[in-house]
Amino acid sequence: EPTMYGEILSPNYPQAYPSEVEKSWDIEVPEGYGIHLYFTHLDIELSENCAYDSVQIISGDTEEGRLCGQRSSNNPHSPIVEEFQVPYNKLQVIFKSDFSNEERFTGFAAYYVATDINECTDFVDVPCSHFCNNFIGGYFCSCPPEYFLHDDMKNCGVNCSGDVFTALIGEIASPNYPKPYPENSRCEYQIRLEKGFQVVVTLRREDFDVEAADSAGNCLDSLVFVAGDRQFGPYCGHGFPGPLNIETKSNALDIIFQTDLTGQKKGWKLRYHGDPMPCPKEDTPNSVWEPAKAKYVFRDVVQITCLDGFEVVEGRVGATSFYSTCQSNGKWSNSKLKCQPVDCGIPESIENGKVEDPESTLFGSVIRYTCEEPYYYMENGGGGEYHCAGNGSWVNEVLGPELPKCVPVCGVPREPFEEKQRIIGGSDADIKNFPWQVFFDNPWAGGALINEYWVLTAAHVVEGNREPTMYVGSTSVQTSRLAKSKMLTPEHVFIHPGWKLLEVPEGRTNFDNDIALVRLKDPVKMGPTVSPICLPGTSSDYNLMDGDLGLISGWGRTEKRDRAVRLKAARLPVAPLRKCKEVKVEKPTADAEAYVFTPNMICAGGEKGMDSCKGDSGGAFAVQDPNDKTKFYAAGLVSWGPQCGTYGLYTRVKNYVDWIMKTMQENSTPRED
């Protein structure tokens, strides 16, 4: 506990002090006081440098004195034999005696009192920046007019901070400008403009005079500009050393002016203004900016339009242009968006055709569609070449974005039919000679494939079974062969409206309009053993003349069997209708006169016993196309006959082309359109 005064006596004082003693006293007076320590008695064994016995006075780390021997007062009016004055409020006194004393020494008596110190003068370091005022137990600092005492209660400064400038234009100067600026001050000025405007500071060289830097280059007084994480300065010296125009790229600027205790100059003056924040004219490839300007600033809006073949991809949506706004931070909105080459994507596959995997699917790339030749060809033209267009579609010069359509090649057998051995005037055939041949198992009959979805046959074949099972692609109709061949499932049977339906079909004498169409559930895949026959054209070129040759095929009755195991075929000439009329009906179910002959019928055969027979019904009478000798068309359909091995009657398909086309069109699926 600090005290204002006290007494310190050597051990046993006033008796002789003992040998081998070390004793210390810690003196402490209140803060703001010094200590006056004085001795009124001193009787300690004398030795050189007081090495044996001594009293030591220590202030902090400093030894103030070391005493030994005897002393007496020089002043008859004062009992003081030795004294110490320290400006600190703590002191240590240490007494030491060695192991022997040659005489009897009485030691010492000392007193201490708290004394006032003058902080304003007693120290090397002046405690106040301006005026120092001492009082008993302390001091205080004071300032000249217009200065204020800082929180440290020692330094005076000018009240130059706290100003916030929000106007878009203004002027700021150091305190007292152009008179010398105050020493020992930190002036902070804040410029806060609306977002989207940058502070631009303008200075003239002659408007700046601040105490120069020291020999190490450090500014003693300095002016600093801070804009966000960017700093301009510190600046000092005679004439402004920095750029005369400072674009801060920020709407907020802090100006910090720091001065020390010495060397005041006239200071500085600056102007500032707010510029709309500029946004860089960015180089966005493959695009055009609208409007085009030399400089873009805050709130400017541009439309960035991609060049043809380029698009902006945002998420999954592609667009050809986007808007970008110059934002308050000097950056463009939507800056992540870029005009990329349009990607047309993996081209769609097509039925019965293919497209090679493209090296690239980007704008300008070229792909080629091909059909599965020789069984399919490209119906809608265009050559199959598509390029990736600017709108992101694969486009063909002729078809535009419409995909090519691969349709079956008709009337071309993979292997031509060659007559070999005779069988009811016919020969063994291979399905590759007649790839259009369809086998109906109930009743045992034939038909002709005319496209992927349709089979043409005789009306009398399907009148009793509207859900026929059909097969294609097999020469043999043995069960194990059919199990491996393609079975066709009917969706609907369309019998010509002119075909008369009878209660007892067995007694039929009128085979006029003996034609029907079977719509299939699924499309037929074409190949070497399955391929359609063409339909006749409507021109007079397709009118048959007597003697024109046609091919018939089927699994009908032969001389040896009721039903052929393997496909049989024959080449027959067209004959006048009267030749068929003249043949006596083998097993008549009615009067010979009752049998109807019409222009819808073709008569053929009569040569070398070649004829169709029971079980061949519905099969095509195939004639070479007059306009394309590589193709066959279905001139007729096996319909009826007076007697096997003579002449046979065939439905004249040319007369029904309109009905066939209309029926197919009206009953097509979207896939076929």
């Epitope: 086998f439 043995q478 069960t479 199990a483």
Partner: antibody
């Protein structure tokens, strides 16, 4: 109507071979597909193989591969089935069967030939 | 190879009874299934083909049904001539396989 007449019963020793014939009448062999089926006494029917005229190849059941040979003599309309390396479990009635048309698996069956394998 | 499982293996019934025999294929055979009747010492006789088509000359009391893997032969009213062994056969591939047979005997 097709008729199939098979050769008579045979008794063979283990390890020997047997050749069963099947004569076609009422049709030509070239028009037909001939299959061979066997039936062990008191057991079920077991398909052995066939000649496929479309492919011109003979197809054998896995079980008999390497032991059976099926041949045809079209000049006499006779089919043959030869089974070698006979074992007692080959004792069975062997049938020749013509394949049917359009869904019918079989058309005509021979009367059967009993082959007995016994030492 | 496709396995054919026939059940029951033996069936005791009386004249006039309705009899059902089932056949299961180890994989789908569509409708490529036939039923045969065999009497001792005779070759099998085709009754039903295409799972449900009646062979000509076979009495209408025999009927077949099913497709894929499950098939049934039904004799609507058992006659004295019907006591025999019945086999199912798949012919969807060249490797024909038969069921093990169902013997229909007099109760």
């Amino acid at each position: 109507e097709v008729q199939l007449v098979q050769s008579g019963a045979e008794v063979k020793k283990p390890g020997a071979s047997v050749k069963v014939s099947c004569k076609v009448s009422g049709d030509t062999l070239t028009e037909l597909s001939m299959h061979w089926v066997r039936q062990a006494p008191g057991k079920g029917l077991e398909w052995m193989g066939t000649f496929d005229p479309e492919e011109g190849e003979t197809i054998y059941a896995q079980k008999f591969q390497g032991r059976v040979t099926m041949t045809e003599d079209t000049s006499t309309d006779t089919a043959y089935m030869e089974l070698s390396s006979l074992r007692s479990e080959d004792t069975a009635v062997y049938y020749c069967v013509t394949e049917g048309l359009a869904w019918r698996p079989t058309d005509s069956w021979g009367q059967g030939t009993l082959v007995t394998v016994s030492s | 190879d496709i396995q054919m499982t026939q059940s029951p293996s033996t069936l005791s019934a009386s004249v006039g009874d309705r009899v059902t025999i089932t056949c299961r294929a180890s994989q789908s055979i569509s409708s490529w299934l036939a039923w045969y009747q065999q009497k001792p010492g005779k070759a099998p006789k085709l009754l039903i083909y295409k799972a449900s088509s009646l062979e000509s000359g076979v009495p209408s009391r025999f009927s077949g049904s099913g497709s894929g893997t499950e098939f049934t032969l039904t004799i609507s009213s058992l006659q004295p001539d019907d006591f025999a062994t019945y086999y199912c056969q798949q012919y969807s591939s060249y490797a024909w396989t038969f069921g093990q047979g169902t013997k229909v005997e007099i109760k």
